[in-house]
Amino acid sequence: KESCDVQLYIKRQSYHSIFAGDPFKLECPVKYCAHRPQVTWCKLNGTTCVKLEGRHTSWKQEKNLSFFILHFEPVLPSDNGSYRCSANFLSAIIESHSTTLYVTDVKSASERPSKDEMASRPWLLYS
């Protein structure tokens, strides 16, 4: 019998490399059974995760999973950092793994590094 616990499927030690000025959607995959839990996003500041208030969020439904989406419209250099989603389920808090946004502040599209260049940067791989 499948567990009816809420599960948040953000991959452990995942990251996204994005560019300032672009729109970006950060997705929190949520598995639940009967009632969709209340889900929030927070941004890590040291060991504290600061709840993101007043941000544009939405839900997307797929076959076996729902996604709670945090919208960046557009991405700002200050959005660099690690994020976590958490769900309120039966008065318990379930926390996801954190996922990291690496924001590149580029002046124009012609200056954008390729994905290979991004992948070869030690600061990107080991921050």
């Epitope: 599960q7 499927y9 991959k11 452990r12 793994h97 992948a119 791989l125 080991y126």
Partner: antibody
Framework: EVQLQQSGAELVKPGASVKLSCTDS????????IHWVTQRPQQGLEWIGR????????RYDPKFQGKATITSDTSSNTAYLQLSSLTSEDTAVYYC?????????????WGQGTSVTVSS | DVVMTQSPLTLSLTIGQPASISCKSS???????????LNWFLQRPGQSPKRLIY???KLDSGVPDRFTGSGSGTDFTLKISRVEAEDLGVYYC?????????FGGGTKLEIK
Amino acid sequence: EVQLQQSGAELVKPGASVKLSCTDSGFNIKDTYIHWVTQRPQQGLEWIGRIDPANGFTRYDPKFQGKATITSDTSSNTAYLQLSSLTSEDTAVYYCAREDGYPYYTLDCWGQGTSVTVSS
Amino acid sequence: DVVMTQSPLTLSLTIGQPASISCKSSQSLLDVDGKTYLNWFLQRPGQSPKRLIYLVSKLDSGVPDRFTGSGSGTDFTLKISRVEAEDLGVYYCWQGTHFPRTFGGGTKLEIK
């Protein structure tokens, strides 16, 4: 049983490149990470790196940076390892392995390995 | 990099004897999520590695309960209560906490 099927053995000349493949027949690779591990003759296991097929982002052991390039194609559920500027030191068996994701995050399923021999 | 040091290099045992393999890491393997991503693999001759134990002490399905994993922080142990012929091969510890991921050098179990 979930299987990772790797491409066949390769005999390549020094200085050449080779691209190995790893196809997951039972699991959507977008949902996890695919790792590559190497084993030189009579030696232990060494981690090369991993890819997140959902977005193509990679992490490598710095000692393989520039030598190995990991890519994936989610339409065919396949991950690839390209090895460049091959030398006799690159003669080894190369394994792909799948990380099983939530909640254990370990290498639960391995391919059968691809033998690469670098020889003139 | 996190260095994983296994000992002994070789174990030569008779059927029914107990076995103990040590794995020490150069840094703590306790992750920020409170879990310790220390795993044990067995590579039988001519085969791919096979996962035996994950998260220090959890046995993979199909692994006999004569295998036990223990430890925390930087010191870990794999024990076999009574060695059987099918246990021969090379045992590797592997850490999945830090990048780059690293394996121990391996411990070869021979049956006398």
